[in-house]
Amino acid sequence: SPAQRWSMQVPPEVSAEAGDAAVLPCTFTHPHRHYDGPLTAIWRAGEPYAGPQVFRCAAARGSELCQTALSLHGRFRLLGNPRRNDLSLRVERLALADDRRYFCRVEFAGDVHDRYESRHGVRLHVT
């Protein structure tokens, strides 16, 4: 089958109430079939490419475990399995200040060096 292109699928928006939790879905496709090398998953807030990171994890070659390196205020947790092309993120104890746009990003290293980030992101509405 032909190689897939890079793409990222996120919903336009997610709504939740302050104090509750929300899940920010993000799935992706990539052209590097059977890739099992080092991987980094990142979520940032505000704007793509330049906004501050709120979550980051890294998986070693051959591992499904994406070890959390950054979780802002300890409230962000990866639910999706990046090895299964899923970066869905859970945000706990929502505050009104969390009402912003979020962008998911995946980076491949090792034999393959490639990366992709959602351009439009998912808008989190906190009421």
Epitope: H34, Y35, A60, E64, L65, Q67, L78, G80, N85, D86
Partner: antibody, heavy 121, light 107 residues
Framework: QVQLVQSGAEVKKPGASVKVSCKAS????????VSWIRQAPGQGLEWIGV????????GYNEKFKARATITVDTSTSTAYMELSSLRSEDTAVYYC??????????????WGQGTLVTVSS | DIVMTQSPDSLAVSLGERATINCKAS??????VDWYQQKPGQPPKLLIY???NRYTGVPDRFSGSGSGTDFTLTISSLQAEDVAVYYC?????????FGQGTKVEIK
């Protein structure tokens, strides 16, 4: 050939802790994730957590995060799972399982024989 | 957590007949479902990974299908040694979760 050999059955009192071991052989231990999965008598399977022996990094099912600790000793190719504050509902067979991979697909390809942990006063 | 619901809970099939086990995920898990077989007193054994891929050494009477939320394990011609409990498991989300199991017996 790949083998995972677990420690023997344990009987513990409520409130105590138990540490189960899983000795791996037949493959390069640091390269593959090892998960712990339990099965209560006559019940289904429940994933507890995972460790990547190469880095020592761990991930847990939130249900067990406060009570389970997964570690490894790479010098002996052994993974450990310690569960604290035991209660009767923790009575189960505990399995370690290797998360093998093939062409970018991951799966539990080799399992330990299981360790029965009985919690009883 | 993702809930994996298997049906039926138990199944009695004549030797040589087809056995079909269904597994429904509470949300989309892509094709990221494996099937395991467990016999009494033994650990589970991998049969099918990534919904459709038969693991090394597994007889070709076992096949898997499905994606999204609905998955099926089929034993095309039941043999005596297939009497066991079968579990589906999703690995798209953490924590990994299993179905409650389906017991297959001979009618």
């Amino acid at each position: 050939q790949v083998q995972l050999v677990q420690s023997g059955a344990e009987v513990k009192k409520p409130g105590a802790s138990v540490k189960v071991s899983c000795k791996a052989s037949g493959y390069t231990f640091p390269r593959y994730d090892v998960s712990w999965i339990r099965q209560a008598p006559g019940q289904g399977l429940e994933w507890i957590g995972v460790i990547h022996p190469g880095s020592g990094g761990t991930g847990y099912n939130e249900k067990f995060k406060a009570r389970a600790t997964i570690t490894v000793d790479t010098s002996t190719s052994t993974a450990y799972m310690e569960l604290s504050s035991l209660r009767s509902e923790d009575t189960a067979v505990y399995y370690c399982a290797r998360r093998g991979l093939n062409s970018g697909y991951w799966f539990f390809d080799f399992w330990g024989q299981g360790t029965l942990v009985t919690v009883s006063s | 957590d993702i809930v994996m619901t298997q049906s039926p809970d138990s199944l009695a099939v004549s030797l040589g007949e087809r056995a079909t086990i269904n597994c429904k995920a509470s949300q989309n898990v892509g094709s990221n479902v494996d099937w395991y077989q467990q016999k009494p007193g033994q650990p589970p054994k991998l049969l099918i990974y990534e919904s459709t891929n038969r693991y090394t050494g597994v007889p070709d009477r076992f096949s898997g299908s499905g994606s999204g939320t609905d998955f099926t394990l089929t034993i095309s011609s039941l043999q005596a040694e297939d009497v066991a409990v079968y579990y589906c498991m999703q690995s798209n989300f953490f924590p990994f979760t299993f179905g409650q199991g389906t017991k297959v017996e001979i009618k």
